[in-house]
């Protein structure tokens, strides 16, 4: 597990209004895909495996955590940018 300070740093880097990092249960989405061969650029998991994770926001894949995080559209809130704010 990443240290708490590293998590905070990642959040601040991803968004000016940091959201909690949301890491889906990998059991719910099958086994991890194997890493691609060669030195070519890896495809962004947010475009496939986690394409539906952020409901009203943008998915940012945090390589250090092997996990997606969400940056919410204005007015939305929550780990998955799922809800209209109060």
């Amino acid at each position: 597990d990443l240290q708490e300070a590293d998590l905070d740093l990642l959040r601040v880097t991803l968004s000016s209004k940091p959201q909690a990092l949301a890491t889906p249960n990998k059991e719910e989405h099958g086994k991890r895909k194997k890493k691609g061969k060669g030195l070519g650029k890896k495809r962004d998991p947010c475009l496939r495996k986690y394409k539906d994770f952020c409901i009203h926001g943008e998915c940012k894949y945090v390589k250090e955590l092997r996990a997606p995080s969400c940056i919410c559209h204005p007015g939305y809130h929550g780990e998955r940018c799922h809800g209209l704010s109060l």
């Epitope: 998590l7 959040r11 940091p18 909690a20 990092l21 949301a22 890491t23 809130h77 109060l86």
Partner: antibody, heavy 116, light 106 residues
């Protein structure tokens, strides 16, 4: 594996306060909001609020804003909910819960009984 | 806040029977979530994002719907399915739950 372990049952007097704890393990505590849900006897589920352990940011259900106070202690990976000015209406089971794609992990529940 | 109305409130079914529980929302929601709560236990996630099966949930459970109308279906009722079922939305804060459907066995 992810575990949320809550404090034991409480019997308290009307007008007093109670603090329920939820100790998390098996994941990075700061990485997920902690939510709290109320279930009164024989009743359904009510969302109380959520706290972001990383920032301390809290969103309450307006209904519980004057009743509940959510806090966390990151050093012990523990979330707390304090309930104040207790009445018989607050007699319920209180759950902490955490998402994956929804509320997938739940504590075992803490029964709070308000009785004189 | 969005009010979720479940029907029926209580129902009894025979083993092998197909069960459908409906959840009607007072305003349109993006997705619906379903939970099972057996007596004396914490709720358990069954369905997320309207139709996706949570980890470890038997394939006899399925979810569908859109807008303000959603449903949970149990393909073939089994004795272990005796529980109360709740729908939940979080498209608008605060997240809300339906009043529950108590499923009993005949």
């Amino acid at each position: 594996q992810v575990q949320l372990v809550q404090s034991g049952a409480e019997v308290v007097k009307p007008g007093s306060s109670v603090k329920v704890s939820c100790k998390a393990s098996g994941y990075s505590f700061s990485g997920y909001y902690m939510h709290w849900v109320k279930q009164a006897p024989g009743q359904g589920l009510e969302w109380i609020g959520e706290i972001n352990p990383s920032t301390g940011g809290i969103t309450y259900n307006q209904k519980f804003k004057a009743k509940a106070t959510l806090t966390v202690d990151r050093s012990t990976s523990t979330a707390y909910m304090e309930l104040k000015s207790l009445t018989s209406e607050d007699t319920a089971v209180y759950y902490c819960t955490r998402i994956t794609w929804a509320f997938a992990y739940w504590g075992q529940g803490t029964t709070v009984t308000v009785s004189s | 806040q969005i009010v979720l109305t479940q029907s029926p409130t209580t129902m009894a079914a025979s083993p092998g029977e197909k069960i459908t529980i409906t959840c009607s929302a007072s305003s349109s929601v993006t997705y619906m979530y379903w939970y099972q709560q057996r007596p004396g236990f914490s709720p358990k996630l069954l369905i997320y994002d309207t139709s996706n099966l949570a980890s470890g949930v038997p394939v006899r459970f399925s979810g569908s719907g859109s807008g303000t109308s959603y449903s949970l279906t149990i393909g073939t009722m089994e004795a272990e399915d005796v529980a109360t079922y709740y729908c939940q939305q979080w498209s608008s804060y605060p997240p809300t739950f339906g009043g529950g459907t108590k499923l009993e066995i005949k």
